[in-house]
């Protein structure tokens, strides 16, 4: 008789990443009988929710349901109906909601409450919506990339299944850049983590890991830009801000009320003799870089070594995966190649920032002007953060790998979050069975 395929014994999980600038829904899939194996979970879909981050709905919370509809419908289409009720759904909100909570716990709770009610209307197994901590965001990002890179697998392989594989079990560090925060997470080499807040201990697949992590709130690319503008307008002689981080010829009017809306600019707030000011781009990388460095307080450090703002940072160790906005920005600037040195990146940024705004608009006609106008700042910020903030050097730059996806799954905290909440990363190495179940009879 002819072999007949048995129904696929798979499971699904959904995680929504409610970031400061947008929300993304990820659908993951794995073979049910291999739940505890490393590297079996993979992403089958990403749906980017159309619109801004959920914190922007604070004045119209009743519309959050509409905002989420399209991607939740997509999940309903992708996941077989028979699996809907057993598919867990998790929503994790990050720094945008942390900032809203700092302003008003009540408003943040109201937003999350409506999110929960909206997601509960779908036929999935909704497991809750919460604001994750910066430490969790860093830790889960680190788990994700190392899980996908096969670093937790004890089996030695004679072939390489993933890019960046260094054929050893040394984990990669994780560098995550969002709109409102940035995370750095890695295993230091035989170094005591001097600050308990930055220390994590994991036992994964039978191995102990002592991990350093820190999340810098307000140092995501969007909030860093607001900080820089608030700092620079303090010393402007009038309502014109000549800004080296924007292309020559670029002009934009900014409301002072918008500038001071975020808690991230509170330290620079002052009474200004105008309600609006105009940014006029002058496109100078070096001056932009200098202006950005003023956001990093390196004048005091209560530890043996710090990143900035008095935050402990051990000596960098090993390779790093830089993802989320680190990747998106560098990808846009065509600077993700392993062969591009730090000096070359700086050179390219100097050229890019100096290009006239009219020329840039013509070259990238399909890109929204708001996004397009900010790539000079974002690229310069990434260099400043990595070099002066985290102390990468021209030599150690080659250890940074700008990563969008690994094995078809997005690099980011969501996969690690789901693996943890579904107990799919065992503390001990699972006993391997000699044969897996055949899918054919």
């Amino acid at each position: 008789t002819q072999n007949k395929a048995l129904p696929e014994n798979v499971k699904y999980g959904i995680v929504l990443d409610a970031g400061s600038s947008h929300t993304s829904l990820y659908i993951y899939k794995w073979p049910a009988e291999k739940e505890n194996d490393t590297g079996v979970v993979h992403q089958v879909e990403e749906c980017r929710v159309k619109g801004p981050g959920i914190s922007k709905f604070v004045q119209k919370v009743n519309e959050i349901g509409i905002y989420l509809t399209d991607c939740m419908e997509r999940a309903r289409e992708v996941i077989p109906r028979s699996q809907h009720q057993e598919t867990p759904v998790y929503l994790g909100a990050t720094a945008g909601m942390r900032l809203l909570r700092m302003e008003s716990e009540e408003l943040a709770d109201r937003v999350l409450d409506v999110v929960e009610r909206s997601l509960s209307n779908y036929p999935f197994d909704f497991q809750g919506a919460r604001i994750i901590t910066g430490q969790e965001e860093g830790a889960y990002g680190w788990i994700t990339i190392n899980y996908l890179l096969g670093k937790f697998s004890q089996k030695t392989r004679w072939f390489s299944i993933v890019p960046y594989e260094t054929n050893n079990q040394e984990t990669f560090g994780a560098l995550d850049l969002g709109g409102a925060s940035t995370q750095v997470t890695f295993v230091p080499q035989n170094q005591t983590i001097e600050s308990p807040d930055n220390a994590l201990q994991f036992r994964l697949y039978g191995k102990d890991y002592n991990v350093y992590t820190h999340s810098f709130l307000c140092y995501g690319k969007d909030q860093a830009l607001w900080q820089k503008l608030a700092k620079d307008i303090q010393v402007a002689s009038n309502e014109i801000l000549r800004d080296p981080c924007f292309h020559p010829g670029y002009k934009k009017v900014v409301n002072v009320s918008d500038l001071y809306k975020t808690p991230c600019t509170k330290r620079f707030e002052m009474t200004l003799p105008f309600q609006q000011f105009e940014i006029q781009g002058i496109g100078n990388y070096q001056q932009c870089h200098q202006s950005i460095l003023e956001l990093f307080n390196t004048s005091y450090c209560p530890y043996s070594q710090c990143a900035f703002n008095g935050i402990f940072l051990p000596p960098l160790q090993g390779d790093f995966g830089a993802f989320s906005a680190f990747y998106f920005v560098m990808k846009f600037l065509n600077l993700t190649s392993e062969k591009v040195s730090q000096e070359k990146v700086t050179e390219m940024m100097k050229k890019f920032c100096a290009q006239p705004w009219e020329e840039i608009k013509t070259s990238y006609a399909g890109v929204k002007e708001k996004y397009l106008s900010e790539y000079c700042f974002s690229g310069t910020y990434i260099l400043s953060l990595l070099l002066q903030g985290y102390h990468f050097t021209a030599d150690s730059w080659e250890h940074i790998h700008f990563i969008g996806k690994i094995q078809g799954s997005d690099a980011g905290w969501t996969l690690g979050y789901m693996l943890n909440l579904t107990n799919m990363i065992p503390a001990e190495q699972p006993l391997s069975t000699p044969l897996s179940h055949s899918t054919y009879v």
């Epitope: 509409i66 419908e73 399909g366």
Partner: antibody, heavy 121, light 106 residues
Framework: EVQLLQSGPEVVKPGATVKISCKVS????????LNWVRQYPGKNLEWVGN????????RYNQKFKGRFTITIDQSKNTAYMELRSLTSEDTAVYYC??????????????WGQGTMLTVSS | EIVLTQSPAILSLSPGERVTITCSAS?????MHWFQQKPGQAPRLWIY???NLASGIPARFSGSGSGTEYTLTISSMESEDFAVYYC?????????FGQGTKLEIK
């Protein structure tokens, strides 16, 4: 300001294939789904399908699946709909449109001016 | 698919009159949207998410409802309100429209 500019009217014979276009400007092309809707002269509106330019994923009304195909050319900021095996029943105005929330969470809904397709022998 | 049934199909009335158009869904939807269309023009969003007026829409228009029953109300008809109104659901695919209600001058 979001604008959707559709290609001009088409007159074709039954059985023919036609491709109509919708060029968008004023926003990032990958930010919103692009929908196609058709309307018989003076009659009902019917959703044909949509495309998510971010992922490339498409959805269709079952009624049109297989005969109508929605595609995009990101470099041109343009969406297309190819209509095959046309009959007189396909004579209608075809609209492209998009909707969603902007960066300030304001809801918007924009339509192209419509493309009149006449199928006649 | 979710079928939307509007009533009435045609309504003849005079300026100043109060009007209520209903839209019934064959199964529950989370929100309803309403469009106005005038001859030779593309439809224009009028009310979104059941009760929110789109930008520039006069306050004499209102929307309400939940589940399977939704209404659009005009408190006092004005000459520019004579048009065809369509309801649409965007809660599940395929997206569907009502068959339209034509408001004409008596």
């Amino acid at each position: 300001e979001v604008q959707l500019l559709q290609s001009g009217p088409e007159v074709v014979k039954p059985g023919a294939t036609v491709k109509i276009s919708c060029k968008v400007s004023g926003y990032s092309f990958t930010d919103y789904n692009l929908n196609w809707v058709r309307q018989y002269p003076g009659k009902n509106l019917e959703w044909v399908g949509n495309i998510d330019p971010y992922s490339g994923g498409t959805r269709y009304n079952q009624k049109f699946k297989g005969r109508f195909t929605i595609t995009i050319d990101q470099s041109k900021n343009t969406a297309y709909m190819e209509l095959r095996s046309l009959t007189s029943e396909d004579t209608a105005v075809y609209y492209c449109g998009l909707y969603g929330y902007d960066d300030d969470a304001n809801y918007f809904d924009d339509w192209g001016q419509g493309t009149m397709l006449t199928v006649s022998s | 698919e979710i079928v939307l049934t509007q009533s009435p199909a045609i309504l003849s009335l005079s300026p100043g009159e109060r009007v209520t158009i209903t839209c019934s869904a064959s199964s529950s939807v989370s929100y309803m949207h309403w469009f106005q269309q005038k001859p030779g023009q593309a439809p224009r969003l009028w009310i979104y998410a059941t009760s929110n007026l789109a930008s520039g829409i006069p306050a004499r228009f209102s929307g309400s409802g939940s589940g399977t029953e939704y209404t659009l109300t005009i408190s006092s008809m004005e000459s520019e309100d004579f048009a065809v109104y369509y309801c649409q659901q965007r809660s599940s695919y395929p997206l569907t429209f009502g068959q339209g209600t034509k408001l004409e001058i008596k």
